[in-house]
Interface confidence: medium
């Protein structure tokens, strides 16, 4: 019946206008939970982040005219008070309570206790089989307006089937006597009587039956599918794949930008062997002497062998230290150890293939051209 607007309205009127809907309220960062165990014991717990290292005290009364009593049975969490257990004075009473830090009230409220009922778990559950049906019975609780819910499944069912009655006498028909069935039972408070904030009881123990006889387990019960988990894994994998792809793409783009802004300058010492040693840098003589053959080689340690080269006319390349870099740590490690950054479009490990005036040269980042 929705949220029992009329019933709640009456409660608000009765409680002098203070009634927060739902199972908790908040004041000064205090959250409250009330559970009325089987109309016998009331448990009020609080979560006060602001007072996490404080022993808050709980004061209560069951009658609006009485003086407050202090809790004598506190619940502790990490050495500090976090709740109170009360014997219920009267089953339909309003609980007036105040949670205090010393003398300062941090949360004060009134609640109809029955709105927070949690019935006890079904006792003395029995099964009576007759052909393709079973009647499940248990001891009715000593108060009414409850629903007794039986859930059952066979190994071939993907989810639990459910049937409920307002007494603990539930007959389930259309069962297959050859199949093994698992059963469990719980008690729920009727929402139209107790409101929407009650708690179902704990489930009874699972019992398994086949051909009217109790079994230890329905061993062949398939584990329920976990679509949520596999979906999560799939989405995670796709996300990681996408991120890696984007990272590689961005690195490639950065490399292209760097090449565009800072063109590679060949090192004549490495690229033109004999140009300086034999021909004292005379390019025309060197070309004639080498009979128009360009040596496409780069010694592994060529740059380390040759000393720092002075530019002949114009130094187009800035020093590497000044070059902007946006590399991931792996790339930085590779470069520091002398390895080259392997990108798909690079044809040779030694450097870039560059053509000048019909001649092909292999260059790396430290090469330059004398014009």
């Amino acid at each position: 019946m929705g949220r029992l607007v009329l019933l709640w309205g009456a409660a608000v009127f009765l409680l002098g206008g203070w009634m927060a809907l739902g199972q908790g309220g908040a004041a000064e960062g205090v959250q409250i939970q009330i559970i009325y165990f089987n109309l016998e014991t009331v448990q009020v717990t609080w979560n006060a982040s602001k007072y996490s290292r404080t022993n808050l005290t709980f004061h209560y009364r069951f009658n609006g005219d009485e003086a407050y009593d202090q809790c004598t049975n506190y619940l502790l969490q990490e050495g500090h008070t976090s709740g109170c257990l009360l014997d219920a004075e009267q089953r339909d009473d309003i609980l007036y309570f105040s949670i205090r830090n010393g003398t300062h009230p941090v949360f004060t409220a009134s609640r109809w206790m029955v709105y927070y009922l949690k019935p006890s778990s079904p006792k003395h559950v029995r099964f009576s089989w007759h052909q393709d049906a079973v009647t499940v019975t248990c001891s009715d609780l000593s108060y009414g307006d409850l629903l007794y819910e039986v859930q059952y499944r066979s190994p071939f069912d993907t989810e639990w089937q459910s049937k409920q009655e307002n007494t603990c006498n539930v007959t389930i028909e259309g069962l297959d006597a050859e199949k093994c069935y698992s059963f469990w039972v719980r008690v729920k408070a009727m929402e139209d009587v107790y409101g929407p904030d009650t708690y179902p009881s704990d489930w009874s123990e699972v019992t398994c039956w086949q051909r009217g006889e109790i079994r230890d387990a329905c061993a062949e019960t398939p584990t329920p599918p976990k679509p949520k988990l596999s979906k999560f894994i799939l989405i995670s994998s796709l996300a990681i794949l996408l991120m890696v792809s984007l990272l590689l793409l961005s690195l490639w783009k950065l490399w292209r930008v760097k090449k565009f802004l800072i063109p590679s300058v060949p090192d004549p010492k490495s690229i033109f062997p004999g140009l300086f040693e034999i021909h004292q840098g005379n390019f025309q003589e060197w070309i004639t002497d080498t009979q128009n053959v360009a040596h496409l080689h780069k010694m592994a340690g060529a740059e380390q062998e040759s000393g720092p080269e002075e530019p002949l006319v114009v130094q187009l390349a800035k020093t590497e230290a000044e070059s902007p870099r946006m590399l991931d740590p792996q790339t930085e490690e590779k470069e520091a150890s002398g390895g080259s950054l392997q990108l798909p479009h690079q044809p040779l490990q030694g450097g870039d293939v560059v053509t000048i005036g019909g001649f092909t040269f292999v260059m790396n980042d430290r090469s330059y051209v004398a014009l």
Epitope: A10, R91, V114, Y143, D192
Partner: antibody, heavy 118, light 107 residues
Framework: QVQLQESGPGLVKPSGTLSLTCAVS?????????WSWVRQPPGKGLEWIGD???????NYNPSLKSRVTISVDKSKSQFSLKLSSVTAADTAVYYC???????????WGQGTLVTVSS | DIQMTQSPSTLSASVGDRVTITCRAS??????LAWYQQKPGKAPKLLIY???SLESGVPSRFSGSGSGTEFTLAISSLQPDDFATYYC?????????FGGGTKVEIK
């Protein structure tokens, strides 16, 4: 102060249906209470017939369950009793009463005598 | 169903007497028991609830005690206005049930 007032015919023929209404005043029928019917045959004790919550949820005495219907009309702030297939044994003073949730009866109507006779 | 048995069914007493009425439940009802007083031609009136709690406006000469299956209503000093029939009622479990009643009459 809650007041309850029964009304209905004082004479019902055997095998007929006894119909009574209880008007609630001085309080809301939507409150956290159950609205009950109790009867008392002449010179005998009290017998609980059944009760209803404003939502329509009912509880009946098993000894009368097959013949009893209790209903509520929130718009008129009243609830009703119907007892079918009556016999002389159903002759009694019928009281409507308010019962606090899972509790005792705290307010009663003054009662109305219903005689089953041809 | 729970049966409620009251004893005695009739009790003769004089003004000023101490009177006790017993109510027995066929199974435990903890303390979910009420006592009512009824005078001829009138509706029952609540005296005691939850076995021992005195209803507002009821004279303190009335008291209730007991738990489980045995309960007692006591009138410490009987007054002329107290001559009536008294009923116990359990409300621990459906169906609600009344005792057969005890009539307190003038000796």
């Amino acid at each position: 102060q809650v007041q309850l007032q029964e009304s209905g015919p004082g004479l019902v023929k055997p095998s007929g249906t006894l119909s009574l209404t209880c008007a609630v005043s001085g309080g809301s029928i939507n409150s956290n209470n159950w609205w009950s019917w109790v009867r008392q045959p002449p010179g005998k004790g009290l017998e609980w017939i059944g009760d209803i919550y404003h939502s329509g949820s009912t509880n009946y005495n098993p000894s009368l369950k097959s013949r009893v219907t209790i209903s509520v009309d929130k718009s008129k702030s009243q609830f009703s009793l119907k007892l079918s297939s009556v016999t002389a044994a159903d002759t009694a003073v019928y009281y409507c009463a308010r019962r606090r949730w899972l509790q005792h009866f705290d307010f009663w109507g003054q009662g109305t005598l219903v005689t089953v006779s041809s | 169903d729970i049966q409620m048995t009251q004893s005695p069914s009739t009790l003769s007493a004089s003004v000023g007497d101490r009177v006790t009425i017993t109510c027995r439940a066929s199974q435990s009802i903890t303390n979910w028991l009420a006592w009512y007083q009824q005078k001829p031609g009138k509706a029952p009136k609540l005296l005691i609830y939850k076995a021992s709690s005195l209803e507002s406006g009821v004279p303190s000469r009335f008291s209730g005690s007991g738990s489980g299956t045995e309960f007692t209503l006591a009138i410490s000093s009987l007054q002329p206005d107290d001559f009536a029939t008294y009923y116990c009622q359990q409300y621990n479990i459906y169906p609600l049930a009344f005792g057969g009643g005890t009539k307190v009459e003038i000796k």
